[in-house]
């Protein structure tokens, strides 16, 4: 399953696939998550080793039984791929480092304003893949505002210095924020010259298409059908690269397909999985296992279970079957695709789905009517289990905010339905960041049920908690996908990076924002804020969060919405937005549902029809 | 030039049998799977029923499973469909199809032929 | 099965008109999705394949979008021989599934 904890002080012994330089283990980690044969990595901070050369090292590691010997190595910090973790699942990279010189071949320098405007930069320019920016504050003033875009031969820097007054980070192109668009569009019977960057076996284009969207360096592809003339090189796909980003010349070329990469789409990327099984084709590779399975389905399942699993073959043959059951072929390469591909047989084949970002499951957790005010914008794909809550009845508005925890399932504050219980005049709007841009024709999710805690009573700020079950499952994308929950009774954490974002008033007597709002808030104890509520009681159910001198704060049109936290890289919602004395008052902090508090109840309501908690535990 | 010619079509009474065939010319046969599509009188496209390139594989819509095989000799290439146990609604031009490589499209289509179950 | 869904199962429209056919799987089908045109008494004629592939031959006024579960087939400027029944067909999974058309009629 998904193991998505963190050892600190703690490194992998042997097992490497792979070694590169990453700015943080959070990098790393991704890495290996997209490494085909990945599944632990240990990093090296710069502050845990003197050796220059293996300062910021990322050690990708491979075990046949899914782990290592874990050696004490101070500073270093270990973990688990993310493989089979659905929608954690991503190659967005938003952090910006600080202090740090990301080393690449630099092949275009510019001036700019701000690191944001250099990553934008990095983002729209189609052959960069990551950047530095050397602040006004540099020491050589030649330098200052240089904004120097780069690229490497495996998509991370080779060599990473620590350097003051220079800021470096990733392309958002995996975020889908490229501006640049894509070509859609796959061509058959043209072969695309230039050079190849690699080659693989892939059962039809798309699959050469996905493959070459995620590689670093892939900017577009020729594949080979199985009818291809030349019997060695039907079905190679061929992943490419230019000086100038687009082919430089194609030749009309019997059962050829070209195309490009999808990276610098805007909006959608296609998932990194291949989920389509192929009947009448064997793909060939490394034996992992043998099985007896009754149906090429539970076949894909079986392999994606296992996680070193990479693809299988369902064999029908006679010989291979016994009463329904029939031989599934679990398989594994170097990189990840079959090195054979055998069609007219009787065989299915296919891959395992364990980069898939939709898993099944229906509630994140994990084990280990109020706007914001003093806010600022936020941008695309930064807080993609945000949604607003409207209601249409003559016009239509946004009321509440809220947190998508699953396909089908919003949590958010009870308050919110306070005179309006009735699920037909709600509209739930996911994946936006301005509210301007609903049109009658913007997808929305109506509710197929309300649950409102049964300890709730109007009025009252106790137990401000509701689940929404709506009536369709979401598909999880870069800009919608779900926050996960904290573990039951969560108090030993302390959360020292905590956000809350909202449309609500950015003044006590304002109006809904246009574009979602984001601030940064730090938690007060329970303690302190009761002596700022004396009239209240502030219950262990509850959470607050306010600056003493006020001036950021949630307001109205907030509710519902998510005090969230980072925690070892990984998002949770700490906090359902509730109530509080007006807004961004002096030494009057915000007070939010806990949510660590109600996981139980949570769970409970979110049970599948047959019984089964449908939630997906990352640990 | 890429052609496929259906026949064998007719009329035939419920519960009979028909045998249809598709001739293949201008592509090598044998390298590529085959399907057969149909269309009721006034309705949409069915898919009916596909076939692996050297035959080891064969798929069927559900209704008409167990009662209608596919088959293929590649030395003559010639793609067959054998109807048993007919029904009323059954009747529909038959198509035969070649899919695209690589791209998973149906880009070659027969002309059909016209299957009519009836007492 | 994946069942496609096309709306609306009929239009009437003018010589230059810009028309819009839409085509819904019940599951993603990622970009597996085709477009054919059938005129009365002739076979299937592939249009747009891989969602939004313009196949060889076909006029440029025929484009495709979409992915995952919605797709869209768009004729930018209609012509006297488009009047025509158009088909989507996911070809993700089996069995194929075709929508159950569009007919195109004149006004």
């Known amino acids: 399953g998904c193991l998505t904890q963190l050892y600190e002080n703690a490194f992998f012994r042997g097992g490497d696939v792979a070694s590169m330089y990453t700015p943080n283990a959070q990098y790393c980690q991704m890495r290996c998550t997209f490494h085909p044969r990945c599944l632990l990595f240990s990093f090296l901070p710069a502050s845990s080793i003197n050796d220059m050369e293996k300062r910021f090292g990322c050690f990708l590691k491979d075990s046949v039984t899914g782990t290592l010997p874990k050696v004490h190595r101070t500073g270093a910090v270990s973990g688990h791929s993310l493989k089979q973790c659905g929608h954690q699942i991503s190659a967005c990279h938003r952090d910006i480092y600080k202090g740090v010189d990301m080393r690449g071949v630099n092949f275009n320098v510019s001036k700019v304003s701000s690191v944001e405007e250099c990553q934008k930069r990095c983002t729209s320019n189609i052959r960069c893949q990551f950047f530095s920016y050397a602040t006004q504050t540099f020491h050589k003033a030649e330098y200052r505002n240089n904004c120097l875009l780069k690229y490497s031969p495996g998509g991370t820097p080779t060599a990473i210095k620590v350097l003051s007054n220079v800021e470096s980070g990733f392309s958002l192109k995996p975020c889908a924020l490229s501006e640049i668009g894509c070509h859609m569009n796959i061509f058959q019977h043209l072969a695309f010259s230039d050079v190849d960057v690699a080659r693989v076996l892939t059962p039809d284009a798309f699959v050469c298409r996905t493959i070459c969207t995620y590689h670093p360096n892939c900017l577009f592809f020729t594949f080979y059908t199985n009818v291809w003339k030349i019997e060695s090189q039907r079905n190679v796909c061929l992943l490419k690269t230019s000086e100038s980003g687009t082919p430089s010349s194609s030749t009309p070329q019997e059962n050829t397909i070209s195309g490009y990469s999808l990276l610098t789409c805007k909006r959608t990327l296609p998932e990194p999985c291949h989920s389509k099984i192929y009947p009448g084709v064997d793909f060939g590779g490394e034996e992992l296992n043998v099985t007896f399975v009754k149906g090429v389905n539970v076949c894909q399942e079986t392999c994606t279970k296992m996680i070193r699993c990479q693809f299988f073959t369902y064999s029908l043959l006679p010989e291979d079957c016994k009463e329904e059951k029939c031989k599934c072929f679990l398989r594994l390469s170097m990189d990840g695709s079959p090195t054979r591909i055998a069609y007219g047989t009787q065989g299915s084949s296919g891959y395992s789905l364990r980069l898939c970002n939709t898993g099944d499951n229906s509630v994140c957790t994990t084990k280990t009517s109020t706007r914001i005010v003093g806010g600022t914008n936020s941008s695309w794909g930064e807080w993609p289990w945000q949604v607003s809550l409207q209601v249409k009845l003559t016009a239509q508005r946004h009321l509440c905010g809220g947190s998508l925890i699953g396909h089908q399932w919003v949590l958010t504050a009870a308050h919110c339905f306070d005179g309006l219980p009735l699920q037909d005049v709600w509209r739930i709007y996911s994946g936006i960041l301005n509210l301007s841009d609903i049109t009658k024709d913007t997808p929305f999710s109506q509710i197929k049920e309300i649950i409102i805690h049964q300890n709730y009573k109007v009025s009252e700020g106790n137990h401000d908690i509701a689940l929404i079950k709506l009536q369709a499952p979401l598909n999880y994308t870069e800009f919608q996908k779900p926050i996960c929950l904290p573990s039951k009774g969560d108090t030993s954490t302390i959360y020292t990076n905590c956000w809350v974002t909202g449309w609500g008033f950015s003044k006590e007597k304002g109006e809904i924002q246009n574009i979602l709002q984001k601030v940064n808030i730090p938690l007060v104890t329970n303690e302190e804020c009761q002596k700022r509520y004396q009239d209240y009681k502030i219950t262990q159910r509850m959470v607050c969060a306010g600056y003493k001198e006020g001036g950021k704060d949630a307001c109205k049109g907030d509710s519902g919405g998510p005090l969230v936290c980072k925690h070892n890289g990984m998002w949770r919602l700490v906090g359902i937005t509730s109530w509080g004395e007006g807004c961004a008052r002096r030494e009057q902090p915000g007070v939010y549902t806990k949510v660590a508090e109600y996981m139980d109840w949570i769970l409970e309501k979110t049970q599948s029809s047959d019984g089964k908690a449908q939630m997906q535990s990352p640990a | 030039e890429v052609q496929l010619l259906e026949s064998g079509g007719g009329l035939v009474q419920p519960g009979g049998s028909l045998r249809l065939s598709c001739a293949a010319s201008?592509?090598?046969?044998?390298?590529?799977?085959m399907y057969w599509v149909r269309q009721a009188p006034g309705k949409g496209l069915e898919w009916v029923s596909g076939?692996?390139?050297?035959?080891?594989?064969?798929m069927y819509a559900d209704s008409v499973k167990g009662r209608f095989t596919i088959s293929r000799d590649n030395s003559k290439n010639t793609l067959y469909l054998q109807m048993n146990s007919l029904r009323a609604e059954d009747t529909a031009m038959y198509y035969c199809?070649?899919?695209?490589?690589?791209?998973?499209?149906?880009?070659?289509w027969g002309q059909g032929t016209l299957v009519t179950v009836s007492s | 099965d994946i069942q496609m869904t096309q709306s609306p199962s009929s239009l009437s429209a003018s010589v230059g008109d810009r028309v819009t056919i839409t085509c819904r799987a019940s599951?993603?089908?990622?970009?597996?999705l085709n477009w054919y045109q059938q005129k009365p008494g002739k076979a299937p004629k592939l249009l747009i394949y891989?969602?939004?592939s313009l196949q060889s031959g076909v006029p440029s006024r025929f484009s495709g979008s979409g992915s995952g579960t919605d797709f869209t087939l768009t004729i930018s400027s209609l012509q006297p021989e488009d009047f025509a029944t158009y088909y989507c067909?996911?070809?993700?999974?089996?069995?194929?599934?075709f929508g159950q058309g569009t007919k195109v009629e004149i006004k």
């Open positions: 076939i692996g390139s050297s035959g080891g594989m064969t």
């Open positions: 067909q996911q070809s993700y999974s089996t069995p194929p599934t």
């Open positions: 199809a070649r899919e695209q490589p690589g791209i998973a499209a149906l880009q070659f």
């Open positions: 201008g592509f090598t046969f044998s390298t590529y799977e």
């Open positions: 599951q993603s089908i990622s970009s597996y």
């Open positions: 891989a969602a939004s």
